[in-house]
């Protein structure tokens, strides 16, 4: 999906009002400097691409974050403020339902959410170019 035509300010507002709190809640108990920042993004569409990937794509050691509160709110924000986004996600959602597993917070998931916090932080930067 190409995030170029999203309403970035509305997504930013959704992040600041709710998603950020849910990320904080998920990370509760984690040490500030436990994880290094290794994922970056250069502009807002790129940040959303990386955020979508880390939030919804299973990775080794972290099977799924998609059912977490921050992920559901991220999905809702993208569906509302990115034209055509929800249509592209229908097949992906059906595939995910088939492989849904018991929710376990692993250290790898915490590291991944730490990276997500960094990506969202970059997305919110006022001078970050859109293109």
């Amino acid at each position: 999906y190409d995030f170029t035509n999203c309403d970035f300010e509305k997504i930013k507002a959704a992040y600041l009002s709710t998603i950020s709190k849910d990320l904080i809640t998920y990370m509760s108990g984690t040490k500030s400097t436990e994880f290094n920042n290794t994922v970056s993004c250069s502009n807002r569409p790129h940040c959303l691409t990386e955020i979508q990937s880390l939030t919804f794509n299973p990775t080794a050691g972290c099977a799924s974050l998609a059912k977490e509160m921050f992920a559901m709110k991220t999905k809702a924000a993208l569906a509302i403020w990115c034209p055509g986004y929800s249509e592209t996600q229908i097949n992906a959602t059906q595939a995910m339902k088939k492989r849904r597993k018991r929710k376990v917070t692993t250290n790898k998931c915490l590291e991944q959410v730490s990276q997500l916090q960094g990506l969202w932080r970059r997305f919110n930067r006022p001078l970050l170019k859109q293109q």
């Epitope: 950020s20 990370m27 509760s28 108990g29 984690t30 040490k31 500030s32 400097t33 916090q117 960094g118």
Partner: antibody
Framework: QVQLVQSGAESKKPGASVKVSCKAS????????MHWVRQAPGQCLEWMGE????????DYNQNFRGRVTITVDMSASTAYMELSSLRSEDTATYYC???????????WGQGTTVTVSS | DIQMTQSPSFLSASVGDRVTITCKAS??????VAWYQQKPGKAPKLLIY???MRHTGVPSRFSGSGSGTEFTLTISSLQPEDFATYFC?????????FGCGTKLEIK
């Protein structure tokens, strides 16, 4: 282990600028955010701003915006905080402090006292 | 910005006493609150993070609790080295803000 070593005390006249340094060691400099916090005598701690050394992006407390500039020298693993248009109420101890993506401060510099007086 | 209102500002107590310091946030900060101890001429030292988690090396007599808008730091049995100033800080949202401190003095 992580260490943050700050430059020495400064005395300045009103209207001048001051630049305080914070040399970091014991970790990869680009991995974490560097913040500056100040404490005026008998006053609250006040967060001034932060820098991401990986790309030098800064965020500032609006109370200081326009007067404070935070920079880094990657080759020296050193962060700097410059405060301009000094006034007497800027007399304070200035601290650098380190965080990851979660913003509580588990590592602090020893502090630099800045005195502003005519 | 979120305001952190700390009370009391001053507290007199004796060695062995149990003391409680309170911090109230002007809006919900979940559990994103840290507590610091500061001695004269020194940098603050982290005691508690995530409202209730003790930092490495912090004695078990220090404990934190709370969520949402009300938080407490408790020292179960004061030791001579505990007489200092204590600050709370919220890191739930930008800009990060501190309470104005509680100075704990020997009675």
């Amino acid at each position: 282990q992580v260490q943050l070593v700050q430059s020495g005390a400064e005395s300045k006249k009103p209207g001048a600028s001051v630049k305080v340094s914070c040399k970091a060691s014991g970790y990869t400099f680009t991995s974490y955010l560097m913040h500056w916090v100040r404490q005026a005598p008998g006053q609250c701690l006040e967060w001034m701003g932060e820098i991401d050394p990986s790309d030098s992006y800064t965020d500032y407390n609006q109370n200081f915006r326009g007067r404070v500039t935070i920079t880094v020298d990657m080759s020296a693993s050193t962060a700097y905080m410059e405060l301009s248009s000094l006034r007497s109420e800027d007399t304070a101890t200035y601290y650098c402090a380190l965080t990851g993506t979660i913003n509580y401060f588990d590592y602090w510099g020893q502090g630099t006292t800045v005195t502003v007086s005519s | 910005d979120i305001q952190m209102t700390q009370s009391p500002s001053f507290l007199s107590a004796s060695v062995g006493d149990r003391v409680t310091i309170t911090c109230k946030a002007s809006q919900d900060v979940v559990t994103a609150v840290a507590w610091y101890q500061q001695k004269p001429g020194k940098a603050p030292k982290l005691l508690i993070y995530w409202a209730s988690m003790r930092h490495t090396g912090v004695p078990s007599r220090f404990s934190g609790s709370g969520s949402g808008t009300e938080f407490t730091l408790t020292i179960s049995s004061l030791q001579p080295e505990d007489f200092a100033t204590y600050f709370c800080q919220q890191y739930s949202s930008f800009t990060f803000t501190f309470g104005c401190g509680t100075k704990l003095e020997i009675k």
